[in-house]
Amino acid sequence: ASNFDCCLGYTDRILHPKFIVGFTRQLANEGCDINAIIFHTKKKLSVCANPKQTWVKYIVRLLSKKVKNM
């Protein structure tokens, strides 16, 4: 759910981290209406996720640790 590169809502599915290659943070105070995590998938899709949900935080942490260890 995105428009002009802004997420307008969140996915209601839980994505498996094996399909996700990276993420971008969307901040409500930087031109968009809501805070969001935009997950980038192996199939070049962008999925808007709720940054407060535990599964989202978990994947963000896993990806951040991967980057740190590279």
Epitope: I14, P17, T54, W55, K57, Y58, L62, K65, K68
Partner: antibody, heavy 121, light 111 residues
Framework: QVQLVQSGAEVRKPGSSVKVSCKAS????????ISWVRQAPGHGLEWVGG????????DYAQNFTGRVTISADKATKTVYMELRSLRYDDTAVYFC??????????????WGQGTMVTVSS | QSVLTQPPSASGTPGQRVTISCSGT????????VSWYQKLPGTAPKLLIH???LRPSGVPDRFSGSKSGTSASLAISGLRSEDEADYYC????????????FGGGTKVTVL
């Protein structure tokens, strides 16, 4: 109603390993994270690590990385925590606890009864 | 040394109101919700408050939570003898050291 049932008390020597189990009953295993939290005698609660079984990927507190392995068997709805190179200060009650990963509160809403692990020579 | 800071003890007489503070940083309480747990000796912790101020079903409305900035607090009004226990705050932490952090615990004594 979901319940978490843990394995029984263990006594181990310093330098050895222990593996504790936590079996979920009464609900699907899908949208849960299971964490392990310990309480040493006279101390507070400490998060050891956790796993989202549907992801099959574990995460650990920095203090325990390299010494702990958390795994899940989805068929039996059981999560295991193995702690290696045990030290005297690993003596503690180890609790498993559930988080619903689709919610936005990160809270541990259901806890196991606890497993006492004693490290003694 | 716990990441979240709580006073080690608090006390009150039956019927009084007791408040426990929990102080953190922008990476935990400042950007994530806070939960509170009651721990009685020999038992598992029990969730009292989640999402800063929400009570699970079955938790008496004598327990209330609040959050402001990088601090949170738990209030127990109408203190009762069965409230004598240890109380812990907890929050997700966005730093890479470990995603879940607890306070050191506060022992509440009913005088």
């Amino acid at each position: 109603q979901v319940q978490l049932v843990q394995s029984g008390a263990e006594v181990r020597k310093p330098g050895s390993s222990v593996k504790v189990s936590c079996k979920a009953s009464g609900d699907t295993f899908n949208n849960f994270a299971i964490s392990w939290v310990r309480q040493a005698p006279g101390h507070g609660l400490e998060w050891v690590g956790g796993i989202i079984p549907v992801f099959n990927t574990a995460d650990y507190a920095q203090n325990f990385t390299g010494r702990v392995t958390i795994s899940a068997d989805k068929a039996t709805k059981t999560v295991y925590m193995e702690l290696r190179s045990l030290r005297y200060d690993d003596t503690a009650v180890y609790f498993c606890a559930r988080t619903k990963i689709e919610l936005d509160n990160d809270a541990f809403d259901i806890w196991g009864q606890g497993t006492m692990v004693t490290v003694s020579s | 040394q716990s990441v979240l800071t709580q006073p080690p003890s608090a006390s009150g007489t039956p019927g009084q109101r007791v408040t426990i503070s929990c102080s953190g940083t922008t990476s935990n309480i400042g950007s994530n919700s806070v939960s509170w747990y009651q721990k009685l000796p020999g038992t598992a912790p029990k969730l009292l408050i989640h999402s800063n101020n929400l009570r699970p079903s079955g938790v008496p409305d004598r327990f209330s939570g609040s959050k402001s900035g990088t601090s949170a607090s738990l209030a127990i009004s109408g203190l009762r003898s069965e409230d004598e226990a240890d109380y812990y705050c907890a929050a997700w932490d966005d730093s890479l050291s470990g995603p879940v952090v607890f306070g050191g615990g506060t022992k509440v004594t009913v005088l």
